[in-house]
Amino acid sequence: SPVPPSTALKELIEELVNITQNQKAPLCNGSMVWSINLTAGVYCAALESLINVSGCSAIEKTQRMLNGFCPHKVSAGQFSSLRVRDTKIEVAQFVKDLLVHLKKLFREGQFN
């Protein structure tokens, strides 16, 4: 049976918590990704940003989970208007910001 949206969001949050807590060396070797506006369409925007990071096993599960939230196909190099123009941040900071935002969505009951 399909996983309820609240459960899926909680699992994504728990995966991001895992990443932040288990981080020893710089996450994804300090790779930089485009910063995004944490507004509507956050899942696709986050995936569009993180999909450009390759060879980083620490975020592969997150990429797969975000794929389940995003209704359209996302491929590397693609970017929506949610990108913060010309601003790149480290993956570790991106994950931390995304985590805070998703926990707030969970607390507010916004699962889709």
């Epitope: 609240s6 944490l38 805070v100 926990k103 707030k104 607390r107």
Partner: antibody, heavy 120, light 112 residues
């Protein structure tokens, strides 16, 4: 150490406005919610509303809509409560509190309170 | 709005006694994310409120195990197994599931 430091006591005339502040230290207010709570003399606690300083998403109890305005300035790590058209009913202690940072399940830290007295 | 009704208004006890405070909500306070955000706070004279119990039955760090919370749906209880002098003050239940969040009217625990 996490702390919420509120501005000092205010004595204000009826009809005037006042802006109370709540400054966080030891944490970033963008990472949580800041709530405001009212307590009239010898009375219980009333939730006024809360702000998500990361995006200025604000929720009020409808009974405080029009009376209270909650804002935040992330550069100074401070939340504000503005109260307008003051009457004796607004005489109270006003507390700010933050939601804990894991899942925002509860208020783990409170300010010391600001006493507002409305009197001519 | 969710009305939180606390009983009794005043609770005179002898030190060492058990105390029980009831809190009823006017509707279910199960959040859409599955959690029940029911908290108990203690306010001593001249002080800010302090958290005792969250999500119905979880004791906050540093809270003595003589405090326990229980209940579900619309009916909740705070119990103090052996009242100590430092427990005196006003106890408030609070629901953080539905906006506007609401407090109960308070229960004053005092010496008989």
């Amino acid at each position: 150490e996490v702390q919420l430091q509120q501005s000092g006591a205010e004595l204000v005339k009826p009809g005037a406005s006042v802006k109370l502040s709540c400054t966080g230290s030891g944490f970033n207010i963008k990472d949580t919610y800041i709530h405001w709570v009212k307590q009239r003399p010898e009375q219980g606690l009333e939730w006024i509303g809360r702000i998500d300083p990361a995006n200025d998403n604000i929720k009020y109890d409808p009974k405080f809509q029009g009376k209270a305005t909650i804002t935040a300035d992330t550069s100074s790590n401070t939340a504000y409560l503005q109260l307008n058209s003051l009457t004796s009913e607004d005489t109270a202690v006003y507390y700010c509190a933050r939601s804990e940072e894991n899942w925002y399940d509860f208020f783990d830290y409170w300010g010391q309170g600001t006493t507002l007295t409305v009197s001519s | 709005d969710v009305l939180m009704t606390q009983t009794p208004l005043s609770l005179p006890v002898s030190l060492g006694d058990q105390a029980s405070i009831s809190c009823r909500s006017s509707q279910s306070i199960v959040h859409s994310n599955g959690n029940t955000y029911l908290e108990w706070y203690l306010q001593k004279p001249g002080q800010s409120p302090k958290l005792l119990i969250y999500k119905v039955s979880n004791r906050f760090s540093g809270v003595p195990d003589r405090f326990s919370g229980s209940g579900s749906g619309t009916d909740f209880t705070l119990k103090i197994s052996r009242v100590e002098a430092e427990d005196l003050g006003v106890y408030y239940c609070f629901q953080g599931s539905h906006i506007p969040y609401t407090f109960g009217g308070g229960t004053k625990l005092e010496i008989k």
